[in-house]
């Protein structure tokens, strides 16, 4: 299976909300022998591999933000803990999963990674991730709302606040 990032760069004004999105796709068994663990974390662009480092998002670790379920089931993170930090990660039935960050500040700027771990009975895990940059801007150069720049050569899009 693979993970795709719809956008590689999000540029947002301070105070706005943003939803960062990844999509995972590929063959998914209908049976109960596969589980997916999905999560989000901050990282840095490593010399060897992007997303190797796992830093917290607003003091919440990747373990705090995880989604854990079988197949393409929908799931949400623990609401109370995440929402106290202005965060929510969610997953739908179509392989999309996202993290919403509310009331952005300059400190939220950086590299964000989505991670999917495929877990099978009696097998080693299969791990894939996606990376995207968030730039939070202030002042006259800041956009009026978030602008998302696609990972491919498509034109950029304005994305509505979450």
């Amino acid at each position: 299976f693979k993970v795709a990032t719809l956008y590689s760069l999000y540029v947002c004004p301070e105070g706005q909300n943003v939803t960062l999105t990844c999509r995972f796709f590929g063959p998914v068994d209908k049976g109960h022998d596969v589980t997916f663990y999905k999560t989000w974390y901050r990282s840095s662009r490593g010399e060897v591999q992007t997303c190797s480092e796992r830093r917290p998002i607003r003091n919440l670790t990747f373990q705090d933000l995880h989604l854990h379920h079988g197949g393409h089931q929908a799931a949400n993170t623990s609401h109370d803990l995440a929402q106290r930090h202005g965060l929510e990660s969610a997953s739908d039935h179509h392989g999309n999963f996202s993290i919403t960050m509310r009331n952005l500040t300059l400190l939220d700027s950086g590299l964000y990674c989505c991670l999917v771990v495929e877990i099978r009975h009696h097998h080693s895990e299969h791990r894939v991730h996606g990376a995207m940059e968030l730039q939070v801007q202030t002042g006259k150069d800041a956009p009026s709302s978030c602008v998302a720049y696609p990972s491919s050569s498509q034109e950029s899009e304005n994305i509505t606040a979450a």
Epitope: T35, Y37, R54, F62, Q63, H66, V117, I119
Partner: antibody, heavy 118, light 107 residues
């Protein structure tokens, strides 16, 4: 705060079985693997295997698949390892550790000493 | 199975010294290795993950480097409390295996 509390030391007779427990607090028990690691004096660390509570997925080190059996009870957030047909080679400290999927052994229990002696 | 080899079982050093411990994997494990510290009478603790990143709360005198098959763990300025056994471990594919450990003695 994430913690793993292990059961107390055991003195066992050769041929007997022992069941060691590891109780998790401070996180969603079913979301992380519980690893089991053996340490004999002067022998370093040996991985026995792992269980993912809730799904009951297991991975065993081939060397220990006839020796160890892993179970987990999500109602009490407790993982168990049973060691069967004990011999003096099984005398060791056994650790449980937490491993989030795709990650490392980030929290360890204090260890359970098992002594096999006639 | 992937074999992790720590060439030195013992290393002796003095407070303030720089010391490096090496670990070699029997096949390419990318950067999927960790370093653990085990002090006398205690359980192991995760220090370094993904070959070069410090785990939460680990002092910056501890660093890791390497990829593929050759890895190094370094303490830039040894402190008395660093007396311990240090283990490397790969997290590339099961079975997870540990190196034999390197015992650090403080002169």
């Amino acid at each position: 705060q994430v913690q793993l509390q292990q059961s107390g030391a055991e003195l066992m007779k050769p041929g007997a079985s022992v069941k060691i427990s590891c109780t998790a607090t401070g996180y969603t028990f079913s979301s992380c693997w519980i690893e089991w690691v053996k340490q004999r004096p002067g022998h370093g660390l040996e991985w026995l295997g792992e269980i993912l509570p809730g799904s009951d997925y297991t991975n065993y080190n081939e060397k220990f698949k006839d020796k160890a059996t892993f179970t987990a009870d999500t109602s009490s957030d407790t993982a168990y390892m049973q060691l069967s047909s004990l011999t003096s080679e099984d005398s060791a400290v056994y650790y449980c550790a937490r491993r989030p999927p795709g990650w490392y052994f980030d929290v360890w229990g204090a260890g359970t000493a098992v002594t096999v002696s006639s | 199975d992937i074999v992790m080899t720590q060439s030195h079982k013992f290393m002796s050093t003095s407070v303030g010294d720089r010391v490096s411990i090496t670990c070699k994997a029997s096949q390419d494990v990318s950067t999927d290795i960790a370093w653990y510290q085990q002090k006398p009478g205690q359980s192991p603790k995760l220090l370094i993950y993904s070959a070069s990143y410090r785990f939460t709360g680990v002092p910056d005198r501890f660093t890791g480097s390497g990829s593929g098959t050759d890895f190094t763990f370094t303490i830039s300025s040894v402190q008395a409390e660093d007396l311990a056994v240090y283990y490397c471990q790969h997290q590339y594919s099961t079975p997870w295996t540990f190196g034999g450990g390197t015992k650090l003695d403080i002169k």
